[in-house]
Structures are given as structure tokens and as C-alpha cells.
């Protein structure tokens, strides 16, 4: 119920032991009381006790004081609970009866006789203070007090405001004396269901699901989620917004991992070679003649430059070399020929032209062939023309570069942004990283390409009322309530019928 009308009987006086009809009780008036509480009537009439009724056992004989008793038979004050909005007005009928029968259940005894009765009509506000009164007639006097108080969890001037303290998913609050909610520490909002995040937690970049927590959104870190996360792999750089990599002084490249002053800091080039701060590793060594290798660390064989011509073979000698010439050739580099055009010295379809009045010759080579006798096939890939690990392929008179993924251009010199293809679905933000693109997904999506829609259990919040069963899965973010008998509505919120005593009915 929503409230209780309490009546405290204090003293009853019937000194002459008389009944209402003028007869006397023998040996004395064994007195019990009947109480009837009903809605306000200007003139009290018989009829149902609409607000409740109660009877006492025999409390004494003729004149007696009624003591307070908290339990069992003869409880005092008497309790008349109600489960409706207290209207503020009432009618009360207190009757004193004599019984010749059972002390504990005098109501059931035959031969009960009325001693006296009183009727009170008026207004009464809800409150803890007792209203005391005394009623006299020619034979009797009754002293009593009464009040109306709200039941547990009911508040307000008419006990109509239901408030039950809770500390769960639906709210974290206690109830004020007027029934309004008082949030527990760490919670806020109309229903105290919104946590107060850790003090200083960034409003946009952080959030919380319980008090004093600060959970960072993607791209942010730190106790208060106010520090951005730099680009994955960023070595010598910082960020002012997530996934940025702004290089520290002296560093460059996508990941700020290229030392822009490598030559000065590390002196990588050997054997008197020249160092320049450029190239894929941040530096390039230009070797002096006779040296090779990335750092010009390798001394070349004197024959390395292929000084012997016309198929002569080269032999290394200390500080020098020697050419062994094939038949028909002579000179330090086998550069002179004893052959003439009559010997058909030009290979691979080369044309022979006589020189020095026929004492020597020169070959004019067709495309793709070279050498003084057109004996060498031209390899256009020897100069390593393809950058960024591209593969060089000879194709007839020309050559092509087959580029690795992420590069393009004639020499694979152009870097393709992986993000140019817009790989992130559902409005995700793309970031170019060393191992491919990375997507930062908006709320409600996940996966490498933000292709996975995050669904939640729509029944988790307990949306169905009045004991209904909740079902999900019928559509992604939806639920269906299966109502118990007597309720309708999308969340079973409407009772179909309410008996007059139903607690919701004022």
C-alpha cells in the first residue's frame, strides 16, 4: 500500500458499566472496539468502510487505559493500510462494544451489545505528528490520537510518489523526503544514470561508463585522454592531432626515421668517397675510381672496368692489368684489328665499313647489339634503372620496370598513397602506414576496413515492463516485448484493466 492510517486508543471510561440501551453489563462491560474508516461524508452513513476497517480483542472492563503494543493480538496503535492517493479528508467511526464471549475474537461471539460510538469527519494531512482528541457522551469518555503516514517507498503529501532507492544499471540514487531522487556520489542526470567521469577527463576525447573513469576514444591516450597518439611507427616526431607524425629537427620521412644530417653524424662513406644527405637510406656515397659498394668500402679489381676490347681477356697484375687478345687483334686493349671486312668480322647482322684504305674496319650494329664486332646483346637493365625494389625487364628494344605494390611511374619512383583508393567503409578515416593503410572507425563500426557493424543487445537495458519477456535478433538494434496477460503496448506499459483497489488508481 501507499500509506497507513494509525489510530492510538489511550483511555476508555465507562464508570457505571452501562450499555447504550441503558442496561448495565453483568458483571461489567467487557469492552472491545470496531473502527470503520471511509471517504469524507458530511453526514456519516452506513455502508462499506471504503478506506478499511479493523476490530480489537477485549481491551478491558468498564474503564481502562490502553497500553501501546507492537505485535500480536490487541496491537496499539491500530493500523489501517491503504493503497491509493490519500485525499486529505476522511470519516472515522469508533464503536465500543460489550461481549459476553471470547476475549481474543469477540467479533464472532453472539450477544454483543453496543456501549457507545463516536464519529469524526474532517481533513488530515500526511505527517508524523499525532492529532489527539477526546469524545464524551453522558455515559462514556474516549481519549485517542491518530495520524496518516506513508508506507515504505511512498512519499509526498498524498503518499502518491513512489521512489525506491536503487544502485544498478537503471539508476544510482536515494530518495529525498519529498520523493525526489538524490544521486549517489559519482552519478548525475535526471535518473542518476550518467556517471561523473574522472575530474579533467577530456570532454570530446574521453568518456566513462562508471564514476572516476576516463576511457580514451581512438587516437587519444593519457590519464585524461588529452594526449594524441602519433602515427604508428613514428620514431622522432610528435603529434597535435591523432595519427600525425611531425618530425623533430634534423629528422625526415613519413615516420621521421631518416636522419637529415646522417653524413655529418655518422660519416658512413669510406676511401675518400663523397657523402650526400639524400637517397632511400638518408645518404648516398659517390665512390672514387677503383672503389665500389654502398659505402665505397670495396676496392675494385683493375679488370673491373672491362678495359680489354674485342673479346680480349683481362689479367690482374700488381697496380695494373694485361689484355690477352684473340686472334686478329692487338694493342694494349686489343683495340687494333688485323682483320678486314673480307673476314666478315661483324656478328648479329652488323654492317662492315672499311677504314684506312681497307686496312681496318668498323661495325655498324643493329638495335639491341653493341661491341666493336656487334658481339654483345644490349642489356638495358644493367644500370639498375628501377627504383624502390622494382624489377627491370628487357622488352625488345626497350626495357620496363615492374613496380612493387604501392609504387608507380616509369622507374617506380612514385609512391602511391594506399589511402587514395578510399579503403575505409562507413566514413572511417584512413592513415598511410608502412605495412598498408589503417582505418580509424566511427562509433558503431569496427574491423580493418570499418566493415563490421557493431550490434548491441537491445534487451540489456530491460525495456519491457510489467514482467514481459524481451526478445532480440528480429532486427539489428531492435527488441520485442512479449506481454503477460492483461498488458498491452510496445513495452507492455498499459494495463488493460485496473481493479478499483489497484495501487495506481487515485
Amino acid at each position: 500500500g501507499s500509506g497507513i492510517f494509525q489510530l492510538r486508543l489511550q483511555e476508555f471510561v465507562n464508570q457505571r458499566g452501562m450499555l447504550a440501551n441503558g442496561q448495565s453489563c453483568e458483571p461489567g462491560c467487557r469492552t472491545f472496539f470496531r473502527i470503520c474508516l471511509k471517504h469524507f461524508q458530511a453526514t456519516f452513513s452506513e455502508g462499506p468502510c471504503t478506506f478499511g476497517n479493523v476490530s480489537t480483542p477485549v481491551l478491558g472492563t468498564n474503564s481502562f487505559v490502553v497500553r501501546d503494543k507492537n505485535s500480536g493480538s490487541g496491537r496499539n496503535p491500530l493500523q489501517l493500510p491503504f493503497n491509493f492517493t490519500w485525499p486529505g479528508t476522511f470519516s472515522l467511526n469508533i464503536q465500543a462494544w460489550h461481549t459476553p464471549g471470547d476475549d481474543l475474537r469477540p467479533e464472532t461471539s453472539p450477544g454483543n451489545s453496543l456501549i457507545s460510538q463516536i464519529i469524526i469527519q474532517g481533513s488530515l494531512a500526511v505527517g508524523k505528528i499525532w492529532r489527539t482528541d477526546e469524545q464524551n457522551d453522558t455515559l462514556t469518555r474516549l481519549s485517542y490520537s491518530y495520524r496518516v503516514i506513508c508506507s515504505d517507498n511512498y512519499y509526498g503529501e498524498s503518499c502518491s510518489r513512489l521512489c525506491k532507492k536503487r544502485d544498478d544499471h537503471f539508476g544510482h540514487y536515494e530518495c529525498q523526503p519529498d520523493g525526489s531522487l538524490s544521486c549517489l556520489p559519482g552519478w548525475t542526470g535526471k535518473y542518476c544514470d550518467q556517471p561523473i567521469c574522472l575530474s579533467g577527463c577530456h570532454e570530446q576525447n574521453g568518456y566513462c561508463s562508471k564514476p572516476d573513469e576516463c576511457i580514451c576514444r581512438p587516437g587519444w591516450q593519457g590519464r585524461l585522454c588529452n594526449e594524441c597518439i602519433p602515427h604508428n611507427g613514428c620514431r622522432h616526431g610528435t603529434c597535435s592531432i591523432p595519427w600525425q607524425c611531425a618530425c623533430d629537427e634534423g629528422w625526415g620521412g613519413l615516420f621521421c626515421d631518416q636522419d637529415l644530417n646522417y653524413c655529418t653524424h655518422h660519416s658512413p662513406c669510406k676511401n675518400g668517397s663523397t657523402c650526400s644527405n639524400s637517397g632511400p637510406k638518408g645518404y648516398t656515397c659517390t665512390c672514387l675510381p677503383g672503389y665500389t659498394g654502398e659505402h665505397c668500402e670495396l676496392g675494385l679489381s683493375k679488370c673491373a672496368s672491362n678495359p680489354c676490347r674485342n673479346g680480349g681477356s683481362c689479367k690482374d697484375q700488381e697496380n695494373s692489368y694485361h689484355c690477352l687478345c684473340p686472334p686478329g687483334y692487338y694493342g694494349q686493349h686489343c683495340e687494333h684489328s688485323t682483320l678486314t671486312c673480307a673476314d666478315s668480322p661483324c656478328f648479329n647482322g652488323g654492317s662492315c665499313r672499311e677504314r684506312n684504305q681497307g686496312s681496318s674496319y668498323a661495325c655498324e650494329c643493329p638495335p639491341n647489339f653493341t661491341g666493336s664486332n656487334c658481339e654483345k646483346k644490349v642489356d638495358r637493365c644493367t644500370s639498375n634503372p628501377c627504383a624502390n625494389g622494382g624489377q627491370c625487364q628487357n622488352r625488345g628494344p626497350s626495357r620496363t620496370c615492374r613496380c612493387r605494390p604501392g609504387f608507380t611511374g616509369t622507374h617506380c619512383e612514385l609512391h602511391i598513397s594506399d589511402c587514395a583508393r578510399s579503403p575505409c567503409a562507413h566514413g572511417g578515416t584512413c592513415h598511410d602506414l608502412e605495412n598498408g593503410p589503417v582505418c580509424t572507425c566511427p562509433a558503431g563500426f569496427s574491423g580493418r576496413r570499418c566493415e563490421v557493424r557493431i550490434t548491441h543487445d537491445a534487451c540489456a537495458s530491460g525495456p519491457c515492463f510489467n514482467g514481459a519477456t524481451c526478445y532480440t535478433g528480429l532486427s539489428p538494434n531492435n527488441f520485442v516485448c512479449n506481454c503477460p496477460y492483461g498488458f498491452v503496448g510496445s513495452r507492455c506499459e498499459f494495463p488493460v484493466g485496473l481493479p478499483p483497489s489497484f495501487p495506481w488508481v487515485a
Epitope: 535526471k190 503496448g489 510496445s490 513495452r491 506499459e493 498499459f494
Partner: nanobody, 117 residues
């Protein structure tokens, strides 16, 4: 808590029409489910028509095709248009609201509808 005040009740001839209106206080009115109940003397209070949280409507069998419930969230009102009234429709009509997260219900004070034959 939403405060509800009904209006529009009165005396009408059988087969006549009446429009009941319920004005609600509170800025979150649009989130509440709303309904009309009625109670004739000595009978239980019964659901006449309701607008659920998802906007779906529900009617008692005895009023289907004659009564229409509607709401105007801009004006914080819910209305019940009653056509082809019958003597058995006479009762006190109550406005009822349901809180979206607690399920607690609030009642208006009621408005009397009398149908004379």
C-alpha cells in the same frame, strides 16, 4: 513527474461526438507513452486507447472504429476523438502517462462523460 489535466468532457446525445484533451507538463513529454482509461461507477478502470513508446496505437475492442487517439508533442497534448457515442461509453475518463525508463504511471484527475439516450 508529469502533471496531467484533462478537459473536454460533458453531456452528449447518443450517436454524438466529443473530443477529450489532456495537457501535460514537462519538457520530456514526447518520450512518454500516453493512454486514456475510463471508469464507470462500480466497475474497474479499463484501457480505452493508448499510444505506445514506438508510436503504435492500441484500442479496446468496444471502441475500435469509433474512437481515435492522437498526440501533439509540440503542444504537449494527447487527444481522444470519440464518435458515435453510446450510453455504455458514459464514465469518468482519465489521462495516463508512462515514464520511459522506470515504467511508473501518472494519472490525471479525470473528466466526466455523460451520454443520454
Amino acid at each position: 513527474e508529469v502533471q496531467l489535466v484533462e478537459s473536454g468532457g460533458g453531456l452528449v446525445q447518443a450517436e454524438g461526438s466529443l473530443r477529450l484533451s489532456c495537457a501535460a507538463s514537462g519538457s520530456t513529454f514526447s518520450t512518454y507513452a500516453m493512454a486514456w482509461y475510463r471508469q464507470a461507477p462500480g466497475k474497474q478502470r479499463e484501457l480505452v486507447a493508448g499510444i505506445s513508446f514506438d508510436g503504435s496505437t492500441h484500442y479496446a475492442e468496444s471502441v475500435k472504429g469509433r474512437f481515435t487517439i492522437s498526440r501533439d508533442d509540440a503542444k504537449n497534448t494527447v487527444s481522444l476523438q470519440m464518435n458515435s457515442l453510446k450510453p455504455e461509453d458514459a464514465a469518468v475518463y482519465y489521462c495516463y502517462s508512462v515514464h520511459p525508463s522506470t515504467g511508473f504511471g501518472s494519472w490525471g484527475q479525470g473528466t466526466q462523460v455523460t451520454v443520454s439516450s
